[in-house]
């Protein structure tokens, strides 16, 4: 009664700096609350970027400062990170918890790595 | 860094009631899982209770369900574990711990021992 | 409920010598992780998802196996590594933990 997180190996960021991945989980119960979190890896280290709670069927909700965005489609959750940089190239791995009822489980994917280029300065026009 | 300071254990009758505290510093507490874990004198590991971020989700031991309940208060960055109606076999190390981002417990504390006896 | 049986429950070796534990789950686990306990200190994270190792554990620990047997191995046994170790199952509640095997002087 394992979950199994599944997110794709490898997404390009656009030239505003907005990346999005579908992190989709294979639930062992029938949860009717779940967090997802967004975990980066750089290194060995292990930073929380961004996490929402909801309610099965209702939309994700992050803090307000959040520089995540996302929706929800059954076992599906699109998510969307904004204002990324160069220097957040990285492995971003996605984490599901299977809130309520119990029993709780967790399940992590294995990452997707986010290719992120700075947009070249614009030539100035004389 | 990172510390997990227990506090609050001590000698009560059988029956009685104990309340402890684990005052956590160096993380932003509320961002974490956190859980109680025991260990019987010259025994091992038995995890207790565990409670979620802002405080809802809350999961126990089937040996101290409705017993024990574990609660926080993420201003304080304090965890708490209410102890009633203790048992001779309730005798342990307390002992919180941090739940990491990838699950495992990263951090524990150094624990405070309680003794239940007549 | 998930149970973790460690054998064996203690192992006798040498400094400088392979050290060998076992760990085996009732169903199939997910995410297992390896503790270390010295005598009046609180436990230390070795080893999570099975093989990964935690910050600042040397590489002479290592871990390994999948589903229902997991193994921990310390390559040479420095004399800090004699203590008590214990297996962690952490995918779904209740967390459960091995008995332990202590990993004693000869």
């Known amino acids: 009664k394992a979950m199994h997180v599944a997110q794709p190996a490898v997404v390009l960021a656009n030239s505003r700096g907005t990346a999005s991945f579908v992190c989709e989980y294979a639930s062992p119960g029938k949860a009717t609350e779940v967090r997802v979190t967004v975990l980066r890896q750089a290194d060995s280290q292990v930073t929380e970027v961004c996490a929402a709670t909801y309610m099965m069927g209702n939309e994700l909700t992050f803090l307000d400062d959040s520089i995540c965005t996302g929706t929800s489609s059954g076992n599906q959750v699109n998510l969307t990170i904004q204002g990324l940089r160069a220097m957040d190239t990285g492995l971003y791995i996605c984490k599901v918890e299977l809130m309520y009822p119990p029993p709780y489980y967790m399940g992590i994917g294995n990452g997707t790595q986010i290719y992120v280029i700075d947009p070249e300065p614009c030539p100035d026009s004389d | 860094q990172v510390q997990l300071v227990e506090s609050g254990g001590g000698v009560v009758q059988p029956g009685r009631s104990l309340r402890l505290s684990c005052a956590a510093s160096g993380f932003t507490f509320s961002r974490y899982g956190m859980h109680w874990v025991r260990q019987a004198p010259g025994k091992g590991l038995e995890w207790v209770a565990v409670?979620?971020?802002?405080?809802?989700?809350?999961y126990y031991a089937d040996s101290v369900k409705g017993r024990f309940t574990i609660s926080r208060d993420n201003s304080k960055n304090t965890l708490y574990l209410q102890m009633n109606s203790l048992r001779a076999e309730d005798t342990a190390l307390y002992s919180c711990?941090?739940?990491?981002?990838?699950?495992?417990?990263?951090?524990w504390g150094q624990g405070t021992l309680v003794t239940v006896s007549s | 409920e998930i149970v973790l049986t460690q054998s064996p429950g203690t192992l006798s070796l040498s400094p400088g010598e392979r050290a060998t534990l076992s760990c085996r789950a009732s169903?199939?686990?997910?995410?297992l992780a390896w503790y270390q306990q010295k005598p009046g200190q609180a436990p230390r994270l070795l080893i999570y998802?099975?093989?990964s190792r935690a910050t600042g554990i040397p590489d002479r620990f290592s871990g390994s196996g999948s589903g229902t047997d997991f193994t921990l191995t310390i390559s040479r046994l420095e004399p800090e590594d004699f203590a008590v170790y214990y297996c962690q199952q952490y995918g779904s509640s209740p967390w459960t933990f091995g008995q332990g095997t202590k990993v004693e002087i000869k």
């Open positions: 711990a941090r739940a990491g981002e990838l699950g495992p417990f990263d951090y």
């Open positions: 998802g099975a093989s």
């Open positions: 409670i979620w971020y802002d405080g809802r989700n809350k």
């Open positions: 169903q199939s686990v997910s995410y």
